[in-house]
Interface confidence: low
């Protein structure tokens, strides 16, 4: 479907005469008849197979024809056709004189013809006008013509129908040759297939509209490139869906057992060093001046009894100060002005002269110590508590505060590692010297019997069309990850083909 357009530009009839040579009275009121037909080697009378069109009176004798297309007028003249343009044509243009207002052929005298031209040739569809001029003895006609396609028709012969659309059946505009040009974000033969978000995983993601990325079962993330770990997986990751591979420092079926308490909880205070010593078990090595299981207690600097020879210790903001008894001096009352003659040894200690009597030394009875036997022996000095236990003086006795995992008077006994019931799924626990061992019931394996081996829902290959099967450990069921083009719980149904088009 298209239109043959003829633009009349100028008609010259200087003498104002008809084809017969007779002059028009008072002048030749000129209108045109146009006949468009199939190609003829010699243009001859007969039906105007491609169409006809007539103009009103356009001028008298010689005149230029105004381009009237913008104002809805009739120049260029339109000769529509609804067939494939053959590429060749014959064109007859007749100029007639209208004595009156009735321009019908039967109302005109037979000799009212002013001139007649006939041309034929090849004409390709296109936007460019072909300019032509035909001259006879008395008249001259200048005109141009072209063939263009109707709306929604394209191609060399205006035979290709294409209507732009942006709906379920396609998202495209039409190229000059009638081929589809997809709108941004769409692809495929009919531009029905959305282009997913850049980077969306080809197998694990899909989309129903452009720049979207919807994930198939077992996958997540903006680009559907992150697998979904086992339900309940706390500190673990996966490389395929429903796995739970524990991060460093975590263990157990759901990676929720803390094997790196130091890093995850930072229990040691005041700059102490933390060492892991088993699940949820740790040891804090305190900096000077601190004590307690977590080094949370600040030691008074006087607690280490720095003052000798019976000196009394006073805490100060920036340290401590020793008040020395008579006969002693120095930072720690370590220097003596006494000799054995002054009986400096307390609690029954015996005095021995040194350096020719300039100094002395006390030999203390049991349970006393100090340079003057002035201190009772601290039962914790010998550090009797094993396995990092903390010694506390309690009157005449002493007591050990044990670290987690140890018990006994001197923290010398291991608490059974099995007391925590670490074996999953009814596994039997065995205490070993340096840890524990689980004996697993049938259907389970792993260090803590955390791996289920009894039922593999994928063993029967339930997924069709090369889909990938994943076992959901929590429900003993399978999930099929379908390849592109298939749907259904087992990927058994092909996705419907795109609907056929009306052309």
């Amino acid at each position: 479907s298209g239109v043959f357009q003829l633009q009349l530009q100028e008609f010259i009839n200087e003498r104002g005469v008809l084809a017969s040579g007779r002059p028009c009275e008072p002048g030749c009121r000129t209108f045109f008849r146009v006949c468009l037909k199939h190609f003829q080697a010699v243009v001859s009378p007969g039906p105007c197979t491609f169409g006809t069109v007539s103009t009103p009176v356009l001028g008298t004798n010689s005149f230029a024809v105004r381009d009237d297309s913008s104002g809805g007028g009739r120049n260029p003249l339109q000769l529509p056709f609804n067939f494939t343009w053959p590429g060749t044509f014959s064109l007859i243009i007749e100029a007639w004189h209208a004595p009156g207002d009735d321009l019908r052929p039967e109302a005109l005298p037979p000799d009212a013809l002013i001139s007649k031209i006939a041309i034929q040739g090849s004409l390709a569809v296109g936007q460019n006008w072909l300019l032509d001029e035909q001259t006879s003895t008395l008249t001259r006609l200048r005109y141009s013509y072209r063939v263009i396609c109707s709306d929604n028709y394209y191609g060399d012969n205006c035979s290709r129908l294409c209507k732009k659309r942006n709906d379920h059946f396609g998202h495209y505009v039409c190229q000059p040759d009638g081929n589809l040009s997809c709108l941004p974000g769409w692809t495929g033969e009919y531009c029905q297939q959305p282009i997913c978000l850049s980077g969306c995983h080809e197998q694990n993601g899909y989309c129903s509209k452009p720049a979207e990325c919807l994930c198939r079962p077992g996958w997540q993330g903006r680009l559907c490139n992150e697998c979904i770990p086992h339900n309940g997986c706390r500190h673990g990751t996966c490389s395929t869906p429903w796995q739970c591979t524990c991060d460093e420092g975590w263990g157990g079926l759901f990676c929720d057992q803390d094997l790196n308490y130091c890093t995850h909880h930072s229990p040691c205070k005041n700059g102490a060093t933390c060492s892991n010593s088993g699940q949820r078990s740790y040891t804090c090595t305190c900096r000077p001046g601190y004590t307690g299981v977590d080094c949370e207690l600040e030691l008074s600097e006087c607690d280490s009894n720095p003052c000798r020879n019976g000196g009394s210790c006073k805490d100060q903001e920036d340290g401590y100060h020793c008040l020395c008894p008579p006969g002693y001096y120095g930072l720690h009352c370590e220097h003596s002005t006494l000799s054995c003659a002054d009986s400096p040894c307390f609690n029954g200690g015996s005095c021995r002269e040194r350096n020719q009597g300039a100094n002395y030394a006390c030999e203390c009875p049991p349970n006393f110590t100090g340079s003057n036997c002035e201190k009772k022996v601290d039962r914790c000095t010998s550090n009797p508590c094993a396995n990092g236990g903390q010694c506390l003086n309690r009157g005449p006795s002493r007591m050990c505060r044990c670290r987690p995992g140890f018990t006994g008077t001197y923290c010398e006994l291991h608490v059974s590692d099995c007391a925590r019931n670490p074996c999953a799924h009814g596994g039997t626990c065995h205490d070993l010297e340096n840890g524990l061992m689980c004996t697993c019931p049938a259907g389970f394996s792993g260090r803590r019997c955390e791996v289920r081996t009894s039922i593999d829902a994928c063993a029967s290959s339930p997924c069709f069309n090369r889909a990938t099967c994943y076992t959901d450990l929590s429900t003993d069921t399978f999930v099929c990850n379908c390849p592109y083009g298939f749907v259904g719980s087992r990927c058994e149904f092909p996705v419907g083909l795109p609907p056929s088009f009306p052309w």
Epitope: C182, P184, G185, T187, I195, S198, G199, P210, A211, R222
Partner: antibody, heavy 120, light 110 residues
Framework: QVQLKESGPGLVQPSETLSLTCTVS????????VNWVRQPPGKGLEWMGR???????SHNSALNSRLNISRDTSKNQVFLKMNSLQTEDPGTYFC??????????????WGQGTSVTVSS | DIVLTQSPALAVSLGQRATISCRAS??????????MQWYQQKPGHQPKLLVY???NLASGIPARFSGSGSGTDFALTIDPVQADDVATYHC?????????FGGGTKLELK
């Protein structure tokens, strides 16, 4: 009409944190992505990161550990926080809207930029 | 990351045609789409989008500007060049994360 405006301190000390705000009008943050792009003096443009229409964020991995991008849709604001500022971080920082959430439509509206200097 | 290479400067006469090129280290095409944008930036101003998806003119941009290319080789053409076109022109790809920009080409008048 569509407008974006960056604001924040012009001077930041080395190793301190840069905090910028992009206030938008004329469009909804729940329909369009907003990007942060910076330009060192006399140099080219560097994409830093974006907050998507659904609130998801993505960063340039070269800045990932230092960068945090967030938004408050009720206030029509997008925020950029970058810690441990270094001597190579000064420049003009732009926020830019990404057309209709599709990356192939480009960044069709930009703020006028805010200049950041790193100096003690 | 995809690296975009532009020549630093280009000098043309008023009224002539200017062609600014941008080469990508790998293809920036998805299906039939070439995810390459062009921006104009005048001194002291923010960038302005000229062309998206390699050949689509952004809203309000005069037809003197046009974009072309596919795969790894792209060009921005200004024909004819006017005095107001003196600026730096940046190409930007949005196919892969992270989006990257070229170093910019400074257009100067001869």
């Amino acid at each position: 009409q569509v407008q974006l405006k960056e604001s924040g301190p012009g001077l930041v000390q080395p190793s301190e944190t840069l905090s910028l705000t992009c206030t938008v009008s004329g469009f909804s943050l729940t329909r369009y992505a907003v990007n942060w792009v910076r330009q060192p003096p006399g140099k080219g443009l560097e994409w830093m990161g974006r907050v998507m229409d659904d609130g998801d964020t993505s960063h340039n991995s070269a800045l990932n550990s230092r960068l945090n991008i967030s938004r408050d849709t009720s206030k029509n604001q997008v925020f950029l926080k970058m810690n441990s500022l270094q001597t190579e971080d000064p420049g003009t920082y732009f926020c830019a809207r990404e057309g209709d959430g599709f990356s192939w439509y480009g960044m069709d509206a930009w703020g006028q930029g805010t200049s950041v200097t790193v100096s003690s | 990351d995809i690296v975009l290479t532009q020549s630093p400067a280009l000098a043309v006469s008023l009224g002539q045609r200017a062609t600014i090129s941008c080469r990508a280290s790998q293809s920036v095409s998805i299906s039939s789409y070439n995810l390459m944008q062009w921006y104009q930036q005048k001194p002291g101003h923010q960038p302005k989008l000229l062309v998206y998806a390699a050949s689509n003119l952004a809203s309000g941009i005069p037809a003197r500007f046009s974009g072309s290319g596919s795969g790894t080789d792209f060009a921005l053409t200004i024909d004819p060049v006017q005095a107001d076109d003196v600026a730096t022109y940046h190409c930007q790809q949005s196919k892969d994360h992270p989006p990257t920009f070229g170093g910019g080409t400074k257009l100067e008048l001869k």
